[in-house]
């Protein structure tokens, strides 16, 4: 799993737009039935918030035990609390399930800070507000953890939706979504609409509010506006993509595009922030500082350590720039851009000292493991994880937070040459060099 500020939280070459638009996603060749349209039963099936994660209700075992499970596109294990823990209201009780099967194998997952470990087994799993199917899936029963579960988050497990290559203990442990597709007629795709509130939510408000939608097996048109634009999944491990250009308020950061993807760029619903490689982060912050220079902020704010507050309702969104990421398109030499607002990258936080002021954390941070397009990016967009066609789609989310002057955007096409050069090739460890 990605290091750094991941949930569970502990705490390019651009060019002129082409004259012709590429075909809209819906104009492409027909797709298998049941793949698109309306998925009323799945709309609004997520709750939560960017700082603590978005979760879906799932049932495990026979008779079914209901648990809230964090939706994480940055990992590949289905793992649930299976022993008492101070932060868990409930947990999976294997001994009460007649369909539980023990795999007699342990699993240990360390993070930069914290870890979880558990015992592998399989059981019957379903998603009440998902497709009407039950699957036998691998489950890691978490028996011990450190800084994994979050007090007050209201989730008891994690649903890793990425590929088998990054599953623990190894890629032979089939991830939940692979099992789902293999055992049912559910198409090999899911889509996420994460809805940031735009203001801090206390625990009871999170429980009462809708956090978004996970549409399993399809695309729901009511969840986005405009067109869906697709970027190829570079490699099926994380949901890896290629960023070809970055702009702050329309100003190109002018870095070698390899830097944007060093050592990878991934789409990860289990990370709060937009995380950028060190060099890119420094250039981006310098540019954002320059753009918002009517007011000076302390270094601690840009490092995500200090909150900045304005009197209620007076946040000057207009002094902060928009950020555009250009992604490799599906057509040779074609890219598109996704643009987020400060309403996405300034994350509302409840400050203990005051209730009448609006306080924010800067939700862009530094990474040593590449770019992570976390919840603050995803909250601007409806994101389609089209595994069947090895691509990820972005459209403007119908629930994104904006103001009367600016809105998040997905626009294209743009002419961009040599985009393949933007990908970084992680050196493979040569086993032979390790022999002595």
């Amino acid at each position: 799993t990605q290091h750094g500020i991941r949930l569970p939280l502990r705490s390019g070459l651009g060019g002129a737009p082409l004259g012709l638009r590429l075909p809209r996603e819906t104009d492409e060749e027909p797709e298998e039935p049941g793949r698109r349209g309306s998925f009323v039963e799945m709309v609004d099936n997520l709750r939560g918030k960017s700082g603590q994660g978005y979760y879906v209700e799932m049932t495990v075992g026979s008779p079914p035990q209901t648990l809230n499970i964090l939706v994480d596109t940055g990992s590949s294990n289905f793992a649930v609390g299976a022993a008492p823990h101070p932060f868990l209201h409930r947990y999976y009780q294997r001994q009460l399930s007649s369909t539980y099967r023990d795999l007699r194998k342990g699993v240990y997952v360390p993070y930069t800070q914290g870890k979880w470990e558990g015992e592998l087994g399989t059981d019957l799993v379903s998603i009440p507000h998902g497709p009407n199917v039950t699957v036998r899936a691998n489950i890691a029963a978490i028996t011990e953890s450190d800084k994994f579960f979050i007090n007050g988050s209201n989730w008891e497990g994690i649903l890793g939706l990425a590929y088998a290559e990054i599953a623990r203990p190894d890629d032979s442990l089939e991830p939940f979504f692979d099992s789902l597709v293999k055992q049912t007629h559910v198409p090999n795709l899911f889509s996420l609409q994460l809805c940031g509130a735009g203001f801090p939510l206390n625990q009871s408000e999170v429980l009462a509010s809708v956090g978004g939608s996970m549409i399993i097996g399809g695309i729901d048109h009511s969840l986005y506006t405009g067109s869906l634009w697709y970027t190829p999944i570079r490699r099926e491990w994380y949901y890896e993509v290629i960023i070809v250009r970055v702009e702050i308020n329309g100003q190109d950061l002018k870095m070698d595009c390899k830097e944007y993807n060093y050592d990878k760029s991934i789409v990860d619903s289990g990370t709060t922030n937009l995380r950028l490689p060190k060099k890119v982060f420094e250039a981006a912050v310098k540019s954002i500082k320059a753009a918002s220079s009517t007011e000076k902020f302390p270094d601690g704010f840009w490092l995500g350590e200090q909150l900045v507050c304005w009197q209620a309702g007076t946040t000057p969104w207009n002094i902060f720039p928009v950020i555009s990421l250009y992604l490799m398109g599906e057509v040779t030499n074609q890219s598109f851009r996704i643009t987020i607002l400060p309403q996405q990258y300034l994350r509302p936080v409840e400050d203990v000292a005051t209730s009448q002021d609006d306080c924010y954390k800067f939700a862009i941070s530094q990474s040593s493991t590449g770019t992570v397009m976390g919840a603050v990016i995803m909250e601007g967009f409806y994101v389609v994880f089209d595994r069947a066609r090895k691509r990820i789609g972005f459209a403007v989310s119908a629930c994104h937070v904006h103001d009367e002057f600016r809105t998040a955007a997905v626009e294209g096409p743009f002419v961009t040459l040599d985009m393949e050069d933007c990908g970084y090739n992680i050196p493979q460890t040569d086993e032979s060099t390790l022999m002595t």
Partner: nanobody
Framework: DVQLQESGGGSVQAEGSLRLSCTAS??????MGWFRQAPGKEREGVAV????????YYADSVKGRFTISQDNAKSTVYLQMNSLKPEDTAIYYC???????????????????????WGQGTQVTVSS
């Protein structure tokens, strides 16, 4: 249009009192304060108030003698100056900032660099 309008300056004998007022318009400000500049010296922070949480910050040289306050509408800030000394002679400027930040120290609060909006200044002269 952003405006900070000071009033209340003047001449006074040592140990006397003055009350400065600053009325702000244009924005809602979180931090408002008073700074001063004596001839040939750098501009220095005197007192600052955080409208959001009511915190006040004072320079050591004025602690116990000066009091910063604001009216209920929060668009006017006052500096009550008692026990004035000749070394308090300076041009007094009202300054404002739209945001505040957690962990703000007195040094930061009284640093003119953090303030974006400034008044024209009002002269205070204290004679012995």
């Amino acid at each position: 249009d952003v405006q900070l309008q000071e009033s209340g300056g003047g001449s006074v004998q040592a140990e006397g009192s003055l009350r400065l007022s600053c009325t702000a318009s244009g924005y809602t400000y979180s931090l408002m304060g008073w700074f001063r500049q004596a001839p040939g010296k750098e501009r220095e922070g005197v007192a600052v108030i955080n409208s959001g949480v009511g915190t006040t910050y004072y320079a050591d040289s004025v602690k116990g003698r000066f009091t910063i306050s604001q009216d209920n509408a929060k668009s006017t800030v006052y500096l009550q100056m008692n026990s004035l000394k000749p070394e308090d002679t300076a041009i007094y400027y009202c300054a404002a900032r739209r945001s505040w930040f957690t962990g703000m120290t007195t040094t930061q609060a009284l640093d003119p660099d953090w303030f974006s909006y400034w008044g024209q200044g009002t002269q205070v002269t204290v004679s012995s």
